[in-house]
């Protein structure tokens, strides 16, 4: 739990209070709404960014189609129920008393139901497809100077491996960024895919959760990328239970 | 050295408000969280919530929420706790403390509720 | 909120001996956990922080061991004036809480 020492501050997240009072007086910065120390040297959970949110004062195709089973996260903000690691609890509950299954992610993936549900198991996303429209430019972007400078930015940026970013798709004005990560692929250390997307869609709406840092500038051989629409598709190890009623 | 200076005994009618400060010293009053902390007549400890006086920001304990205000004065570097709505059950002695692991405590303020 | 329990409420010991004092919370809250001492009439005193790490000023017979949600005060050899209610917090998440205590009291 260290933060940069020099001033105490927490570069990867500004939605944080940081002190001196850390294990031997080093800095330690706590998420806003939960309290928990977070490790400034990579991205935060998004279930503590969540909660830290809710308390402060989204014709012939390359284009991936996404499976029956990927979900949109619909219900919007919500305060979550983090566990000791910061991420997401199985089930979350309003305080109506009404409940529902989260993946990693955190996006609902049954009926809502009352106190009696029971959600076994955090169910993993292991694919997560960002649909991106670019506002209009003088012709098309490269497709390879493009699928070069999104991996560096999930990269540099987001600290991600390269290895997750599986595929950038463009069919003009369409991106597409595939992230994949198994659970088996997962080392201790590596950033989740769930938590660099959120990172992503943040900085994408002019929302940096970096400190001091200015917005993402994102240019392809210098012409800026401008998106005007984002849409995250999540696709789960398991797939979702909802209702046939929901479906229709 | 540091230093935690609470304010004196209060005695107060149930329904009225308590405001019990704590003046901090010998330290960088804008860099460590000051909590506050109860204790009534032979119990144990109860955390009431915090304040982090660099922005005023401000958290908590979910049973005093509707009733507690924390507040700050940088340039004496003061924090206040106001308590509301006092009931007997208030009856206590009211302590601020540095940091997340308390390392420095205030003398603490009894404050007693009875009509 | 996180849960801490300590036991056991009361030890009776004897100048000299060993304090050996528990400390376990409802879910895994790594090394944030604090130790006071507390006397009648004072406030607490914080004896061990983050689980293991000693103040400057408190006798190196205390000591502090334990992680994720079990951990123990020790007194190697009590001194006349360790016998106090001994507590508990946790610091790794809001609501900050508190043990309900161990009163360490001569036998």
């Known amino acids: 739990h260290t933060a940069a020492q020099d001033n105490c501050t927490c570069p990867t997240n500004k939605m944080t209070v940081c002190s001196p009072d850390g294990p031997g007086g080093r800095c330690q910065c706590r998420a806003l709404g939960s309290g928990m120390a977070v490790d400034c040297s990579t991205l935060t959970s998004k279930c503590l960014l969540l909660k830290a949110r809710m308390s402060a004062p989204k014709n012939a195709r390359t284009l991936v189609r996404p499976s029956e089973h990927a979900l949109v996260d619909n219900d919007g903000l919500y305060d979550p129920d983090c566990d000791p690691e910061g991420r997401f609890k199985a089930r979350q509950c309003n305080q109506t008393s009404v409940c529902w299954c989260v993946n990693s992610v955190g996006v609902r993936r049954t009926d809502k139901g009352d106190l009696s549900l029971r959600c076994d198991e955090l169910v993993r996303t292991h694919h997560i497809l960002i649909d991106l429209r670019h506002r209009p430019t003088a012709g098309a972007f490269n497709h390879s100077d493009l699928d070069a400078e999104l991996r560096r930015l999930f990269r540099e940026r987001y600290r991600l491996h390269p290895k997750f970013v599986a595929a950038v798709h463009y069919e003009q004005p369409t991106i597409q960024i595939e992230l994949r990560q198994n659970t088996s692929q997962k080392a201790a250390g590596d950033v989740d895919i769930g938590d660099a997307a959120y990172y992503f869609e943040r900085d994408i709406k002019g929302e940096s959760l970096f400190q001091g840092r200015g917005g993402l500038d994102l240019r392809v051989r210098g012409e800026p990328l401008q998106v005007e629409r984002t849409l995250i598709y999540y696709l789960d190890e398991i797939p979702p239970k909802f209702s046939m009623k929901r479906l229709t | 050295q540091v230093q935690l200076v609470q304010s004196g005994a209060e005695v107060k009618k149930p329904g009225a408000s308590v405001k019990v400060s704590c003046k901090a010293s010998?330290?960088?009053?804008?860099?460590?969280?000051i909590n506050w902390v109860r204790q009534a007549p032979g119990q144990g400890l109860e955390w009431m919530g915090n304040i982090y006086p660099s922005d005023s920001y401000s958290n908590y304990n979910q049973k005093f929420k509707d009733r507690v205000t924390m507040t700050r004065d940088t340039s004496t570097s003061t924090v206040y706790m106001e308590l509301s709505s006092l009931r007997s059950e208030d009856t206590a002695v009211y302590y601020c403390a540095r940091g997340s692991s308390f390392d420095y405590w205030g003398q603490g303020t009894l404050v007693t509720v009875s009509s | 909120e996180i849960v801490l329990t300590q036991s056991p409420a009361t030890l009776s010991l004897s100048p000299g001996e060993r304090a050996t004092l528990s400390c376990r919370a409802s879910q895994t809250i790594g090394t944030s956990i604090h130790w006071y001492q507390q006397k009648p009439g004072q406030a607490p005193r914080l004896l061990i922080y983050?689980?293991?790490e000693s103040i400057s000023g408190i006798p190196a017979r205390f000591s502090g061991s334990g992680s994720g949600t079990d951990f123990t005060l020790t007194i190697s050899s009590l001194e006349p004036e360790d016998f106090a209610v001994y507590y508990c917090q946790q610091s790794n998440s809001w609501p900050f809480t508190f043990g309900q205590g161990t009163k360490l009291e001569i036998k």
């Open positions: 010998g330290y960088t009053f804008t860099s460590y969280w």
């Open positions: 983050y689980a293991s």
